[in-house]
Interface confidence: medium
């Protein structure tokens, strides 16, 4: 996966099906599916197969793929059949460098920022879409309000909070409200004629491999809300972390590779080596997420052309105490966002 320690180059030769050039049929109609869908490893998407019949665990980078067993679309993988000439029956899942994204049937180029509607700003990086809400009213504006309502205002994109229980209440709780908002993890500072606001980082868009985390900040010269993004990699997809769990234990909070290596991103290599910590896994229904982390800047050098730098989530420590809602849905964490359906639908 991108932004993971540089992988060793592997060549793959598909096993011969039979000594013939006839193309095997991988799809059967009518569909024959197991009664219950499979349980996929953490970070592997549960998708409909290429026959549009059954739920399957998507094939990952380097896995065999066929017209039925398709590659993970969330990872920007495609089935490379070039090693199976002339039948083109079994391929290998490969990464498209700088792959674009598709959201609601619209294709976006790698690195493109876009607004699917007026309430969200999204960014496409290597096949992954990360979105951040632009309407920054996550809670009622008055602490004393017992019956708040979220209403649409004609001519305005974002809904506003209305308090029905006491319209005569004096408006003297604004400072308290600001403090309550700051306590939620948002960074607040007062500038002249501007309350600077930085939202918390959104959850990483993938449970393993390269993802995006975004936030909104108006800490700039214009005091204008702008989206910031950082790359995140909670855990590698190509390592079975469960194998590292000690005997008698149910979780491994942190997984750390033995050796420091370079990060790679779209064919470019970090200018220095890193030995990152990754969040581990549990054998029960708990999830491991970052507990102590920060954002670092990683410089990349490209074989041809100029280098660049990217903001990257750096994990210091993780904890394993949350229930996993759906470990195969890489956008599961977005469900806690207001108006999530507006992104998903």
């Amino acid at each position: 996966t991108a932004l993971s320690p540089t992988p060793t180059t592997m060549t793959f030769t598909p096993a011969p099906l039979e000594e013939t050039t006839t193309r095997p049929e991988f799809c059967k109609w009518p569909c024959e599916c197991p009664q219950s869908p499979p349980r996929c490893p953490l970070g592997v998407s549960l998708i409909t197969d290429g026959c549009e019949c059954c739920k399957i665990c998507a094939q990952q980078l380097g896995d065999n793929c066929t017209e039925a067993a398709i590659c993970d679309p969330h990872r920007g993988l495609y089935c490379d059949y070039s090693g199976d000439r002339p039948r083109y029956a079994i391929g290998v899942c490969a990464q498209v460098v700088g792959v674009g994204c598709v959201l609601d049937g619209v294709r976006y180029t790698n690195g493109e920022s876009f607004q699917p509607n007026c309430r969200y700003n999204c960014t496409c990086i290597d096949g992954t879409v990360g979105c951040t809400p632009l309407c920054l009213s996550p809670r009622p504006p008055r602490l004393w309000c017992r019956q708040p309502r979220h209403v649409r205002v004609p001519g305005q994109c974002c809904e506003q909070w209305v308090c029905d229980d006491d319209a005569r209440r004096p408006r003297q709780t604004a400072l308290l409200d600001t403090r309550a908002f700051a306590a939620s993890g948002a960074v607040e500072q007062r500038y002249e004629n501007c309350i600077a606001y930085t939202s918390p980082w959104s959850p990483c868009s993938t449970t393993c491999g390269l993802g995006i985390s975004t936030r909104i900040s108006n800490v700039n010269a214009r005091c204008w809300p702008e989206q910031e993004s950082r790359l995140c990699n909670l855990r590698p997809c190509d390592v079975d972390i469960q194998l590292h769990i000690k005997a008698g234990k149910k979780c491994l909070a942190v997984y750390q590779p033995e050796e420091a290596t370079n990060f790679t991103l779209a064919g470019c290599v970090s200018t220095r080596t890193y030995r990152p910590k990754y969040c581990g896994v549990c054998t029960d229904n708990r999830c491991c997420i970052p507990y102590k982390s920060k954002t670092i800047s990683v410089d990349f050098q490209c074989p041809e052309g100029p280098g660049f730098s990217r903001q990257v989530l750096w994990i210091n420590a993780c904890f394993c105490n949350l229930s996993c809602r759906n470990p195969n849905d890489i956008f599961a964490d977005l469900e806690s966002y207001p108006d999530f359906e507006e992104i998903a639908n």
Partner: antibody
Framework: QMQLVQSGAEVKRPGASVKVSCKAS????????INWVRQATGQGLEWMGW????????GSAPAFQGRVTMTRDTSIGTAYMELSGLTSEDTAVYYC?????????????WGQGTLVTVSS | QSVLTQPPSASGTPGQTVTVSCSGR????????VDWYQHLPGTAPKLLIY???RRPSGVPDRFSGSKSGTSASLAISGLQSEDEADYYC???????????FGTGTKLTVL
Amino acid sequence: QMQLVQSGAEVKRPGASVKVSCKASGYSFTNFDINWVRQATGQGLEWMGWMDPNSGNSGSAPAFQGRVTMTRDTSIGTAYMELSGLTSEDTAVYYCARDDFYDSSGFDAWGQGTLVTVSS
Amino acid sequence: QSVLTQPPSASGTPGQTVTVSCSGRSSNVGSNTVDWYQHLPGTAPKLLIYSSNRRPSGVPDRFSGSKSGTSASLAISGLQSEDEADYYCAAWDDSLNVYVFGTGTKLTVL
């Protein structure tokens, strides 16, 4: 020159709260985590928790969870540690210390310490 | 209750080399780097070694650190009278999510 300067000694009654401040200077306050460590008389060093001044995120050792609150004011480069429900066992010298956890560089700068005495 | 164990005391004569040990477990010393601190009475602790074997600028090269498995050690060569202090090892613990200090070793220069 990089330094951390803490508030003065405090005497508190059991059950009360104490708030210790730690003012940073000589470096970018939001680039380094602030940790709190205490040492009771005749005892070893005990880590209480950490705070990221940039995000305001913090975490504390299980022994202090529910009793310790770590906050900051980035405009004046100051971190605060408030400990509530004080007992005589909380009598100790409290230190703030900075660390760059990304570089695993240890606690490379410490405050001078604040003596908190809990007595009835 | 500290999870890093150090000998309570150590001693040596000027010029000698003294080693202080620190024993932990796989979740702290075994999987993270170790820091060493010198603590003189009435002063703030001072970082001596970080990342198991690296010295901050200003720390004499008489101080060196090493780590193997779940144990770490601090060596002080050419012992001097001003080295008389308490020494603590410390490491992050991935299971407890705490930065754990060792029990401390009181070094006496005879």
